[in-house]
């Protein structure tokens, strides 16, 4: 099963329950062999994924995996939604599964809901 294809390890149907006002890092785990591909983030708007331009991104290296990180500093209520990362590798575009951010606006929440409450959304 090991190959030198680029792989993006965002899990299908994954989600993150986060709060407006907090910092958050959205990670795209990337496996590559020789040359690190160019990776971008986009946000889903219906069936279209709109590329995120001018956002703070960074790379992190861990053992045999790299992570392309989208920084939220801080999280805004408008950040709620689904995101996807894409890699440009040998002029082919490889897309990840989408991952969803559930943003709770702390101004409208009397107390922070539990993880179970968030998961039941």
């Amino acid at each position: 099963k090991e190959s030198c294809d680029v792989q993006l390890y965002i899990k299908r149907q994954s989600y993150h329950s986060i709060f407006a006002g907090d910092p958050f890092k959205l990670e795209c785990p990337v496996k590559y062999c020789a040359h690190r591909p160019q990776v971008t983030w986009c946000k889903l708007n219906g069936t279209t994924c709109v590329k995120l331009e001018g956002r703070h991104t960074s790379w992190k290296q861990e053992k045999n995996l790299s992570f392309f990180i989208l920084h939220f500093e801080p999280v805004l209520p408008s950040d709620n939604g689904s995101y996807r990362c894409s890699a440009n590798f040998l002029s082919a575009i490889i897309e990840s599964h989408s991952t969803t951010l559930y943003v709770t606006d702390v101004k409208s929440a009397s107390e922070r809901p539990s993880k179970d409450e968030m998961a039941s959304r």
Partner: antibody
């Protein structure tokens, strides 16, 4: 080589709780979903739920909500299934399985050998 | 929940002959990402299940090419071109498109 190690059998009294474990070797469970499946004697398979060990997020089949609690410990590469208020209906084989993701499609999955749970006084 | 209906319940086949199992879902398994998360599992006697096919037609590593998966929407088929003794066991279809994931009732393949 990926392996999932489960205890072979558990005998528990009605009304009690039990915590079944599933330890993965040859793979970091953070890159996977770990899920649990129930098989009653001479019957089919039922999906209980799953955990994303990277962040602890869980999803349960409605039938098992309140009955099952899935947790994971990434330091020991182990997933757990806790079953509460046990009755004879919970007598079954419980399989853990690991679903590993690549770019935009399921990659492969591995199943443990199953733990036979017997609820009896 | 999505109901997965498998037919037949039991299949008795002579070694070397073909076999076919049908699986119908109560709603379409085509996901919004354009993929169909329909798997086939084999549970040999006394063993844990093992996935043979995923995404309708992709063979898992080590699965012989005498196994073929096909179908779309709500109708799916697993075919074995020439049954061998090691193929006996219970076959399950399994959908991962909709929450919660659900399994078919199983088809027992017996060797005549």
């Amino acid at each position: 080589e990926v392996q999932l190690q489960q205890s072979v059998a558990e005998l528990v009294r009605p009304g009690a709780s039990v915590k079944l474990s599933c330890t993965a070797s040859g793979f970091n469970i953070k890159n996977t979903y770990m899920y649990w499946v129930k098989q009653r004697p001479e019957q089919g398979l039922e999906w209980i739920g799953r955990i994303d060990p990277a962040n602890g997020n869980t999803k349960y089949a409605p039938k098992f909500q309140g009955k099952a609690t899935i947790t994971a410990d990434t330091s020991s590469n182990t997933a757990y299934l806790q079953l509460s208020s046990l009755t004879s209906e919970d007598t079954a084989i419980y399989y853990c399985a690991l679903l590993y993701y690549g770019s935009s499609y399921d990659y492969f999955d591995y199943w443990g050998q199953g733990t036979t749970l017997t609820v009896s006084s | 929940d999505v109901v997965m209906t498998q037919t037949p319940l039991t299949l008795s086949v002579t070694i070397g002959q073909p076999a076919s199992i049908s699986c119908k879902s109560s709603q379409s398994l085509l996901d919004s990402d354009g993929k169909t998360y329909l798997n086939w599992l084999l549970q040999r006697p006394g063993q844990s299940p093992k996935r043979l096919i995923y995404l309708v037609s992709k063979l898992d590593s080590g699965v012989p090419d005498r196994f073929t998966g096909s179908g779309s929407g709500t109708d799916f088929t697993l075919k074995i071109s020439r049954v061998e003794a090691e193929d006996l066991g219970v076959y399950y279809c399994w959908q991962g498109t909709h929450f919660p994931q659900t399994f078919g009732g199983g088809t027992k393949l017996e060797i005549k």
